[in-house]
Interface confidence: low
């Protein structure tokens, strides 16, 4: 039966933020796992999504995302199926509106002494706690004239008078945040005295160097007085412009005008109205210098014809909010069709290999445009040029394969050898085209072959046999020099190969036939006895039919082994005193002799006043030293022999003589007395 | 074209032996859910058993401790071995893959 | 075990009518309930899976309905070739049990 190892679970979530539906099913046999939400089944977006078993949320939405979800889990093979617990998100989120005139019903009926009441339009969940500001400045619950029902989302002022006059906001904030009204509300009632807005300025963005226009207007009865102030409180007047305001004009309408607008010049403005009465009126607006930053590079795309595909194209950050839009062969996409724009993403259904090309994200606002080209590759399966063809290889030769193909994008090839991928070394290469190169041919590089070319869209392959021509050669070749063992039985092989299973013989190089003590078996020279007179040159011929004969010249030596006459002994000496190895050997041709000793070679030309090797072969070391002490070989040697014997050297100290013992007392060991 | 034939049916004494065999061919054997399911002469049908494709093995009451069910996904066979044979296990037994998928069924007598 | 209860156990009727065959689980099944097609010396042939899916192959006159413990085979309109036993099978939990079947005869 099918069992769910992980449930979803209803969970808290943020609106806009990342969240996961668990879901994990164990089954005898192959589930698919799916998604309902209220019973219909969900749809993969590049927002909400299946992960593995699992759904996830890129960015949870409050209105997309309410409801049950319900993970099911269906074995198709039986028709059984499973449906998880109901889960479902308890969102949280905070959403701007604007502040709008609840009572009276329009700004029309409102007088002096009436009631007015305000509704901010924030709405979110959990229920936000609301702040109403005046002018920016906090209005506190409990004031003189004016009640707040944070329940309603209201704000009541009882009876309004001209001193409640201004621009009313409202901040909301929850859990999930906070969010401030997105449009004010003006209200103005008469005290002809009173400032009164007209027009209130707005954030602007300007490109550098370009112009920014702030609209500021008041009305009363005197006239009411205007003034403009930067961030650090500094006065903006046409008389008196602060260092980095030179190219700021105030107009007699209130409106400030700033000319080739420079990082400097960013900042918040205020527009103070005073009038007789009442007051002052502070009205705030922002100059953001415009950007756009630069855009990340693409990837090349590569995809396979008949799919669908989607590029997402990432505007850069800016202000304002850089527009996006695809291009292609300097075209703009439309936004339906085959090929077309659907929000940031390039989207190519049902590719066609004519949809390969470049294609360009651009990005614009008003400090200026951004573009990055994707390059897309439709892949297509390849198609044989030339396919390896069964192939004849002359061995110790290089041999070729051909595996020529084409596609997009360039194909890749790989070749198998016994169905063993080749991996290149210095007997194989793969050359760009696909051809196979096989070094120098051996032997056993007959076998069969096989090459794959492949592209994201499909791959081919064909297969051929190596059938190897194998040279006439000898199996292995003969010594060139061999020796014998004098009045012993000897024998001397040799064997060839070739295309044909090649004939052997042996004869003397100077042609004179074989005695008859010696025989030729079939390639091998057999000597019953050996003698003097069968040292000489001889010569193995391999023949056959299509090769013709190669040959190979053996000179064999006629010697006597090596013995040893006189052979080293395990010396003790006392130190100070000289120590003798003797040896001695016997062999034909005569052997020469060489010594070792703690296992290095005595060079006799570089052993020193101390060391000396005898004709004999004896070797003496005077004045024996404790470091002396070790294994010392002989080795005797000759053109056809080498044996070697050795015996250890021990140095000892000389001992002192005990009173009790006599003069003629022996050593405690076996000593070389010198 | 999904097949499963059958053999292994004949007569039997009670208290005999029986192994019925049913040989898969045209799927991927090993991944699939196996039933046995039977039907005595001029009965309804019953479920008798069922091996998953891990192996986990399943028995109607009337046959636990006498029946086994097997399979050798090598050889895409499933197996029934039937021991202390009695009247009335006497049907014609079928095997099935799922729900959609039976073999032509194969006749168990028994009889003294 | 779950008791599978199918009525009627037989029913006469003539080509062209509308048939319906009733199924009752003893204990809540979902919707795990299979119909079957049985013809003499024939092995049964699936007709319905899921309570009310058609298997692949089966004409469109066959429709299954149902979920819980009440469930209904309905045929729109009997063909000769419709003649035969029908089985209910649930598959809602190990032993899976059959109805008892109906028996469809030509009237």
């Known amino acids: 039966a099918i069992v769910f190892i992980k449930q979803p679970s209803s969970q808290d979530a943020l609106q806009g933020r990342r969240a996961l539906l668990r879901c994990e099913v164990e089954a005898p046999g192959p589930v698919h796992v799916y998604w309902l939400l209220d019973g219909a089944p969900v749809q993969d977006t590049e927002r909400r999504f299946a992960q593995g078993s699992s759904l996830s949320f890129a960015a949870v939405d409050r209105l997309q995302d309410s409801g049950t979800f319900q993970c099911v889990a269906r074995d198709d093979v039986t028709g059984e199926e499973a449906r998880s617990a109901n889960a479902s998100f308890n969102i949280k989120w905070i959403e701007a509106g604007p502040v709008v005139l609840k009572h009276p019903a329009s700004e029309a009926e409102i007088q002096p002494q009436t009631q007015v009441t305000l509704r901010c339009h924030i709405d979110g969940h959990p229920r936000p706690t609301y702040q109403w500001f005046r002018d920016g400045t906090p209005l506190s619950d409990g004031q003189s004239n004016h009640t707040v029902s944070s329940k309603e989302r209201n704000l009541t002022l009882r009876p309004a008078g001209p001193e409640h006059s201004g621009l009313y906001s409202c901040c909301a904030h929850s859990a999930f945040g906070q969010a401030c009204s997105s449009q004010n509300f003006t209200l103005s009632i008469a005290d002809e005295s009173f400032a009164r807005v007209v027009l209130a300025p707005q954030d602007v963005v300007v490109a550098r160097y370009e112009e920014a226009m702030f609209h500021c207007q008041f009305s009363a009865q005197p006239p009411p007085s205007l003034q403009w102030l930067f961030e650090d409180e500094t006065p903006i007047t046409n008389r008196s412009r602060p260092p980095h305001l030179r190219r700021a004009t105030v107009f007699a309408n209130g409106s400030l005008l700033l000319t080739q607008v420079r990082p400097r010049n960013a900042g918040i403005y205020r527009c103070i109205g005073q009038g007789q009465r009442g007051p002052p009126i502070i009205l705030e607006a922002t100059l953001h210098l415009a950007e756009i930053e630069d855009m990340p590079l693409f990837e090349p795309r590569v995809f396979t014809a008949g799919s669908e595909e989607r590029v997402t194209c990432l505007p850069p950050k800016g202000l304002p909010e850089p527009s996006v839009w695809w291009e292609h062969a300097g075209v703009r996409l439309p936004t339906h069709g085959r090929v077309y724009q659907k929000g940031h993403e390039l989207v190519l259904a049902n590719i066609a290999e004519s949809d390969a090309g470049v294609y360009t994200c651009h990005a614009a606002n008003l400090a200026g445009q951004r573009r990055q080209d994707v390059n897309i590759t439709v892949a297509t399966v390849p198609s044989w040029l030339k396919k390896p063809q069964d192939s004849q290889l002359e061995e110790g030769k290089p041999g070729y394969l051909d595996c020529l193909t084409q596609a997009t994008p360039k194909p890749t090839v790989v070749w198998y050898r016994n169905q063993m991928l080749i991996s290149e070394d210095s007997r194989f290469e793969v050359f760009k085209n696909g051809t196979l190169r096989i070094n120098s041919v051996e032997v056993y590089d007959g076998t069969w072959y096989r090459c794959m070319s492949s592209t994201p869209a499909g791959s081919i392959e064909a297969q051929a046999r190596v059938q190897v021509l194998e040279k006439l050669k000898f199996t292995p070749p003969p010594q060139p020099q061999q020796c014998m063992e004098f009045d012993k039985e000897a024998t001397v092989p040799c064997s060839a190969t070739g295309r044909e299973k090649p004939t052997i013989k042996w004869e003397r190089a100077d042609g004179s036939s074989l005695p008859e003590w010696v025989t030729d078996n079939a390639g091998t020279l057999h000597f019953a006895r050996v003698t003097r007179d069968d040292a000489g040159n001889y010569t193995c011929i391999a023949s056959n039919g299509p090769q013709g004969q190669i040959r190979a010249h053996v000179q064999l030596t006629v010697a006597v082994f090596i013995t040893f006459k006189v052979e080293p002994e395990r010396t003790t000496v006392y130190q100070g005193h000289t120590a003798l190895l003797q040896c001695e050997a016997q062999g034909d041709p005569k052997p020469l002799i060489q010594w070792k000793g703690k296992d290095r070679i005595l060079d006799p030309t570089k052993l020193g006043p101390r060391m000396h090797i005898f004709q004999n072969g004896s070797l003496v070391i005077h004045d024996v030293a404790p470091e002396d002490s070790g294994r010392y070989t002989c080795i005797a040697g000759n053109s056809c022999n080498i044996k070697h014997t050795e015996a250890p050297l021990y140095v000892v100290d000389k001992p002192v003589p005990e009173e009790s013992e006599g003069p003629g007392s022996p050593p405690p060991y076996k000593m070389i007395q010198t | 074209e999904v097949q499963l034939v059958q053999s292994g049916g004949g007569l039997v004494h009670p208290g005999g032996s029986l192994r019925l065999s049913c040989a898969g061919s045209?799927?991927?054997?090993?991944?699939?859910?196996m039933y046995w399911v039977r039907q005595a002469p001029g009965k309804t049908l019953e479920w008798v058993s069922a091996?998953?494709?891990?192996?986990?093995?399943y028995y109607a009451d009337s046959v636990k401790g006498r029946f086994t069910i097997s399979r050798d996904n090598a050889k895409n066979s499933l197996y029934l071995q039937m021991n202390s044979l009695r009247a009335e296990d006497m049907a014609v037994y079928y095997c099935?893959?799922?729900?959609?998928?039976w073999g032509q069924g194969t006749l168990v007598t028994v009889s003294s | 075990d779950i008791q599978m209860t199918q009525s009627p156990s037989s029913l006469s009727a003539s080509v062209g009518d509308r048939v319906t065959i009733t199924c009752r689980a003893s204990?809540?099944?979902?919707?795990?309930l299979a119909w079957y097609q049985q013809k003499p010396e024939k092995a049964p042939k699936s007709l319905i899976y899921?309570?009310?899916s058609l298997q692949s192959g089966v004409p469109s006159r066959f429709s299954g309905s149902g979920s819980g413990t009440d469930f209904t085979l309905t045929i729109s309109s009997l063909q000769p070739e419709d003649f035969a036993t029908y089985y209910c099978?649930?598959?809602?939990?190990?032993?899976?049990?059959f109805g008892q079947g109906t028996k469809l005869e030509i009237k």
């Open positions: 099935a893959r799922g729900l959609g998928y």
């Open positions: 045209g799927f991927t054997f090993s991944t699939y859910l």
């Open positions: 091996i998953g494709s891990g192996g986990d093995t």
């Open positions: 204990q809540g099944i979902s919707s795990w």
């Open positions: 899921a309570a009310s």
């Open positions: 099978q649930q598959y809602n939990s190990y032993p899976y049990t």
